[in-house]
């Protein structure tokens, strides 16, 4: 069976029907490049005016304008708000009332696209494997990133969150139109990774999405993540404005000027430092969501009532922090280089600025407890990775899971830890699952490109697709079309239940209280320490225009000791950055 031309609110669209075997039978209808909105520079998205005739939806559209990985050029385009749909079809009748899974990509709110990284036309976010194996409709889409998606003056002149509003427009488009493709508009699951996972979280918290979202999956990221909300957007707006020659004293004039500035210039005016800085790299993620009093009306921690009826899966990778550790403490990945106590203390103090000297010392002490009996470099490097994983991913996710569970009415809550080790040959032997390592398994790459993977990788992928799509279908990862290797029990506040996802998933994979000692430290001990600075996110502008990152704060109340200068070789940002 195949859909043929489909009538949407914008007009007719026609995709391609791809047979899944030479013998005929099952197939998948694929639509690429359907417009869901339009947007002017630094303005909220508007509904698309539509078209006459039949739109040939056969090619991915260009990504939203963003800097290249080298950050010295741009690619993509401003006209980028398009979505892609995969609809699995059986032999006889066209599919009807299928669950819908809407993917939100990651990329630090700075990069990425709905189709994902591409190698020889093999796109990372190709929805075919999920759609056909799980019998669900998969939707991916583009949203604006970087300054064009998130620049904000912190007031009505440039409220920001344009990228979040693009995401909302895509979700709302799916709600209104997906029935025509055979989807159930009342069963939409949004899922995403890293910045996409935080976006998923923010979309569930936003009052704009009331009634649109049935379920959600956040993979390595939450609205509560320290890198997910910009507390000082005006500082960064001024930084960009100065670089492109716009006035900075009056936000109205600044906004008006920025809106007529070449979008490429705006994009290139910001560079994420990829060499070690005074502060951890996440402090320099400038263009990210803001609390605008509208789309995100309040601090995310106060918005969990809005998720009371949204089923949620949230989890992290067991070494999510590794990617960030390699930038902040480059020696982590270098066998011939050593991590010192000073290196780690400097990292800790950079992540605990708000609590000053006491916060840094308490945190340093608990994380280095094991160093007395095992002062090996392997243990110290693992500690650095564990610390970054905790601060950036685990703790925010655990707090969010607890909040979701506490506010739940009809909603169910599930937690996981992805522990299938990275396949990167250059990584240390002790390496676990790095940030973004889960993506290939969720999107079925071990099946799509079998020669690049082992049977154990296919086992992981099969299990994840089964749990994810069952959850989309029923709200329970165990119940649906796909058999699962073991029963995944819901998260409870008492036990902190989570599924440990490895190559062999058994009943023993259901575990409790992940890193409970550290969770208690952050939630209780650290939390009650007095705050010593007004705003840990305030960075002063660079004095030299050529400087990549702003200087650290020059606030007298800043009590962060500066460790000795580290002359070690500085690591470059990996080309496959996923956050």
């Amino acid at each position: 069976a195949k859909l043929g031309a489909v009538y949407t609110e914008g007009g007719f669209v026609e995709g391609v029907n791809k047979k899944l075997s030479l013998l005929g039978g099952d197939s998948v209808d694929i639509f690429k490049g359907i417009p869901f909105a339009t947007a002017k520079t630094l303005e909220n998205p508007q509904r698309h005016p539509g078209w006459q005739g039949t739109l040939k939806a056969t090619n991915f559209k260009k990504r939203c304008l963003q800097a290249t990985i080298t950050q010295d050029n741009t690619y993509g385009q401003e006209d980028c708000l398009y979505l892609n749909i995969w609809v699995p079809q059986g032999r006889k009748q066209v599919s009807h009332n299928l669950p819908v899974m809407v993917w939100i990509y990651g990329g630090a709110f700075l990069m990425g696209s709905g189709q994902g990284a591409n190698f020889l036309k093999n796109y990372l976010y190709d929805g075919e494997e999920i759609a056909t194996r799980g019998n669900v409709i998969v939707v991916t889409f583009n949203y604006r990133v970087g300054p064009l998606g998130f620049l904000s003056t912190g007031d009505a002149n440039l409220p920001g969150n344009f990228g979040l509003r693009d995401q909302h427009m895509a979700i709302a488009w799916v709600k209104r139109n997906i029935a025509a493709f055979g989807g159930d508009p009342d069963n939409i699951t949004i899922f995403g990774e890293s910045a996409g996972a935080a976006s998923v979280s923010l979309q569930t918290l936003s009052p704009y999405n009331k009634g649109l979202i049935r379920r959600a999956i956040s993979q390595s990221g939450m609205a509560l993540s320290p890198w997910a909300i910009q507390k000082n957007p005006l500082f960064w707006a001024k930084t960009i404005a100065k670089k492109v020659g716009c006035p900075t004293e009056d936000t109205g004039k600044m906004a008006a000027c920025l809106k007529i500035t070449d979008p490429r210039a705006l994009t290139l005016a910001y560079k994420l430092p990829v060499k070690k800085q005074e502060y951890p790299v996440v402090h320099y993620l400038a263009f990210i969501p803001v609390i605008d009093g509208d789309f995100i009306p309040d601090d995310p921690i106060n918005l969990y009532n809005n998720t009371a009826d949204i089923d949620y899966i949230a989890g992290i990778n067991n070494m999510d922090g590794h990617l960030f550790a390699t930038i902040d403490v480059p020696a982590v990945d270098k066998t011939k280089q050593t991590v010192t106590e000073e290196d780690f203390y400097r990292l800790v103090s950079g992540h605990t600025v708000a609590k000053g000297l006491k916060g840094a010392q308490a945190t340093f002490d608990i994380y280095t407890e094991s160093w007395a009996q095992d002062p090996s470099q392997e243990n110290m490097k693992k500690t650095v990775v564990a610390f970054e994983t905790d601060v950036l991913f685990l703790i925010p996710t655990e707090i969010a899971l607890a909040q979701h569970k506490a506010h739940a009415k009809s909603a169910k809550t599930y937690s996981y830890l992805f522990s299938h080790p990275s396949r990167m040959p250059i990584y240390p032997k002790w390496m676990g699952a790095d940030h973004a390592d889960d993506l290939q398994y969720v999107f079925g790459k071990p099946f799509a490109t079998p020669l690049g993977y082992r049977p154990q990788d296919r086992a992981v992928s099969k299990a994840m697709i089964a749990y994810w799509t069952n959850f989309a279908r029923s709200g329970d990862p165990n119940m649906g079309n796909s058999p699962v290797p073991t029963h995944w029990y819901p998260y409870t506040l008492e036990n902190g239940n989570y599924l440990d996802i490895t190559k062999t998933i058994t009943s023993a994979s259901m575990k409790e209280h992940l890193r409970e000692k550290f969770l208690k430290f952050w939630a209780v001990t650290f939390e009650v320490l007095p705050t010593v600075t007004g705003d840990q996110d305030t960075l002063t502008p660079p004095e030299d225009d050529s400087e990549v990152a702003p200087d650290p704060p020059s606030d007298d109340s800043q009590v962060v000791p500066v460790p000795p200068t580290d002359d070690s070789v500085e690591a470059q940002m990996p080309a496959t950055i996923g956050f």
């Epitope: 043929g4 031309a5 489909v6 009538y7 949407t8 609110e9 914008g10 007009g11 007719f12 026609e14 509904r47 698309h48 005016p49 539509g50 078209w51 006459q52 005739g53 039949t54 709302a172 488009w173 709600k175 209104r176 139109n177 029935a179 025509a180 009634g211």
Partner: antibody, heavy 119, light 105 residues
């Protein structure tokens, strides 16, 4: 100027079929979608479906699926709506209506065709 | 399908009156239009995209709203305005409101 001229009134028996035509003029026929909307006596408007005259693509209201067929003849700039298995509740005025622009409202309407289904 | 609920279903007014008709959608919509229909005639487009006036339509007609709630306003009723008014949402399955009959008081 844009004109949509529909065929005349029809009286049909239950179970029969009816085919209503709508001849377009004053614009490029293949450039705009054509919709069919019906209105039962004293009732509101009900969308039946749409055809793209360019390639013949159609989409029907689920309510009429299996009973309605929309076709077009580009040589005469005419669209047709055929409704089968007629029942008394199909008695209505049937309108063809052309899109205004883009994905737009129904900007131009035919004069309507009364179809009466009676035994 | 998206349901459109119009209110009131009928109303009496006098020439020169200001009249407001509302339409509520069962979910947020993108494309909202208003039509006028007189007895024995085809509907006529008045307002498209919630607030844009169709060509040839007098400026006393205006539309507003977004999301789920929309309004058609006639600022000063004229004798030729007595008719039935329909709201209409454009989606993959377009639907109409049940109509508002505007009668002379």
């Amino acid at each position: 100027q844009v004109q949509l001229v529909q065929s005349g009134a029809e009286v049909k028996k239950p179970g029969a079929s009816v085919k209503v035509s709508c001849k377009a003029s004053g614009y490029t026929f293949t450039s705009y979608n054509m919709h069919w909307v019906r209105q039962a006596p004293g009732q509101g408007l009900e969308w039946m479906g749409v055809i793209n005259p360019g390639d013949g693509a159609t989409s029907y209201n689920q309510k009429f699926k299996g009973r309605v067929t929309m076709t077009r003849d580009t040589s005469t700039s005419t669209v047709y709506m055929e409704l089968s298995s007629l029942r008394s509740e199909d008695t209505a005025v049937y309108y063809c209506a052309r899109d205004y622009y883009g994905s737009s409202p129904l900007g131009y309407w035919g004069q309507g065709t009364l179809v009466t289904v009676s035994s | 399908d998206i349901q459109m609920t119009q209110s009131p279903s009928s109303l009496s007014a006098s020439v020169g009156d200001r009249v407001t008709i509302t339409c509520s959608a069962s979910q947020s919509i993108s494309y909202m239009n208003w039509y006028q229909q007189k007895p024995g005639k085809a509907p006529k487009l008045l307002i498209y995209d919630a607030s844009s006036l169709a060509s040839g339509v007098p400026s006393r007609f205006s539309g507003s709203g977004s999301g789920t709630d929309f309004t058609l306003t006639i600022s000063s009723l004229q004798p030729e305005d007595f008719a039935t008014y329909y709201c209409h949402q454009r989606s993959s399955t377009p639907t109409f409101g049940q109509g508002t009959k505007l009668e002379i008081k």
